[in-house]
Amino acid sequence: LIIGFGISGKHFITVTTFTSAGNIGEDGTLSCTFEPDIKLNGIVIQWLKEGIKGLVHEFKEGKDDLSQQHEMFRGRTAVFADQVVVGNASLRLKNVQLTDAGTYTCYIRTSKGKGNANLEYKTGAFSMPEINVDYNASSESLRCEAPRWFPQPTVAWASQVDQGANFSEVSNTSFELNSENVTMKVVSVLYNVTINNTYSCMIENDIAKATGDIKVTDSEVKRRSQLQLLNSG
């Protein structure tokens, strides 16, 4: 969470941004809020990126002004006019690229004053893992798969019964490059599992942490998975 104050004469407005992460190939959001102003035609929103000449996006006088937009963002950005009314200047970024990572500035001017705040935008790939019982293996084993990760994550297994146990000796993890040659498929197999136990497969890089849980009993298999972005405001 970053709060910036702008000073314009005696007037300043608070602008707040949240560090966020973008998933390569998907749409992302760079979050920015400001003090709403009733005089709507005076609201100017500018998004800038460190090291890039030109603007990422500009919204003024009630509409987008893309005359100074840098070509790398052409056709990929949008702010939402109805949200501007309530002080939300967040930027939608379509088809997130690895090169979109960096420091962005959300600059706001209203009839009350001006302000800005920076945000750090990280890009990578992250996806939810799925754990299945691997019946092909010679012994009872679990297979944890996640289709898209970047940078290469670490994978760890844990179990409810054997808390604190190190499963690296009885697991095998592989990373397979996907067709676009950036992201990778993560596959990890855990051998010698016992029934009536809950196992967790944890995949983590510097952007996200994902966990898949599986509980295997005589009568059923229960699964649960979750994904959490790291260092997000």
């Epitope: 809020t33 003090e35 709403p36 102003d37 009733i38 005089k39 709507l40 035609n41 005076g42 006088e61 009630g62 509409k63 006019a81 109805d82 501007v84 009314v85 309530v86 002080g87």
Partner: antibody
Amino acid sequence: QVQVVQSGAEVKKPGSSVKVSCKASGDTFSNYAISWVRQAPGQGLEWMGGIIPIFGITNYAQKFQGRVTIIADKSTRTAYMELSSLRSEDTAVYYCSRGGPYFDYWGQGILVTVSS
Amino acid sequence: EIVMTQSPATLSVSPGERATLSCRASQSVSSNLAWYQQKPGQAPRLLIYGASTRATGIPARFSGSGSGTEFTLTISSLQSEDFAVYYCQQYKKWPFTFGPGTKVDIK
């Protein structure tokens, strides 16, 4: 001095529609949103929807979606709110106001009575 | 939608006394909150926006405070013309929503 002037009282039959107007002075239409807020007898305030001429967008409260239409005529600086399929519960004073996000100038209100 | 609640429903105060009105939001609205005063037969009048900024022409005896989910409107010394109904309104998210109101009457 900003002025928001609304049309006169209306009596309508259930099932019919009502269209009320609101004329705003000054730069209201080029700079601000126009919202409609209603107040049933003895009740509180209820935001119905609004139009932002400069943004070219309208936004309606879910409760009125499909029944309410708000339009603005920039040339005459007049906003209109039409409410269809009227029922007795729609009997209220309908206010036109300048804003959102908040409302700094209000019209005098129009009493719309829905009765058979 | 964000639900606004106000307390008390009625506040009985003597002229010259201090009145404290509360408003609560069902989720955080930051400082995106306004207060209005309404007298019988009249349109509402904007008192406060941004949780604490007085609107043009509003006397200094009216003050607003709070952020997030808890807000307060304080009238430091009630004048006869202050007896009215007071509404809070959030503008953090569409749809804009009002509280049910607090009626301030003469004790």
